[in-house]
């Protein structure tokens, strides 16, 4: 039997990836981070 039409069974969540660099002071250089959906992961 052919399958009846249905959408895919999962929902795709679109998230924004934001790379940022922050100057933290004279002797400490910079922090480079990756923010995914509002959470810093690197």
């Amino acid at each position: 039997d052919a399958e009846f039409r249905h959408d895919s069974g999962y929902e795709v969540h679109h998230q924004k990836l934001v790379f940022f660099a922050e100057d933290v002071g004279s002797n400490k250089g910079a922090i480079i981070g990756l923010m995914v959906g509002g959470v810093v992961i690197a």
């Epitope: 039997d1 399958e3 009846f4 249905h6 959408d7 895919s8 069974g9 999962y10």
Partner: antibody
Framework: QVTLKESGPALVKPTQTLTLTCTLS??????????VGWIRQPPGKALEWLAH???????SYNPSLKSRLTISKDTSKNQVVLTMTNMDPVDTATYYC???????????????WGQGTTVTVSS | DVVMTQSPLSLPVTPGEPASISCRSS???????????LEWYLQKPGQSPQLLIY???NRFSGVPDRFSGSGSGTDFTLKISRVEAEDVGVYYC?????????FGQGTKLEIK
Amino acid sequence: QVTLKESGPALVKPTQTLTLTCTLSGFSLSTSGMGVGWIRQPPGKALEWLAHIWWDDDKSYNPSLKSRLTISKDTSKNQVVLTMTNMDPVDTATYYCARRQLGLRSIDAMDYWGQGTTVTVSS
Amino acid sequence: DVVMTQSPLSLPVTPGEPASISCRSSQSILHSNGNTYLEWYLQKPGQSPQLLIYKVSNRFSGVPDRFSGSGSGTDFTLKISRVEAEDVGVYYCFQSSRVPLTFGQGTKLEIK
């Protein structure tokens, strides 16, 4: 509110063609994911699925009746039409239309039904 | 075709008591998208069918929480925790995974 209403002849003769109309209100068949199907129920018997049409004109038929059925839509009138050729007394039944909508946030089940229209096939 | 077999076909129940209806499909109704499209409809006397449960276990809006659905693969169950007089009618299981879409033969629930 969402309503569906079936209309058509109460009596048809054997070998004739039946034309049924389902008029929709409270929602539009042109909405992405929207679909309408037809189901029938002979007196005192179980339900039988006949056909379904989607907003994009994709159609599905019950293979056992496919040669006799045509489902179509008139988006401007918000109507779905089912024709069944070569009617026979065994086609005597109440015919229902029902709504079904695809989508990850949709029920994806027949959530609204019409009240049904009774068709008798007799000479 | 996927044959849906319900049992029992007749179900007399005392108000306030639980009730259970079984529905078995002749083959798996797991769709390729990962969902199982098993639905339950109730047809009250003289009325059109109405949706109770979709995708095995999800209650439709407005359906009392005494109704619950469960199962997987080919074996499904509708349970009513405490039957009320307004629950009388014919209950149909229905699969919409494969064409043709098919109903069970119906279970008639009546009050003792």
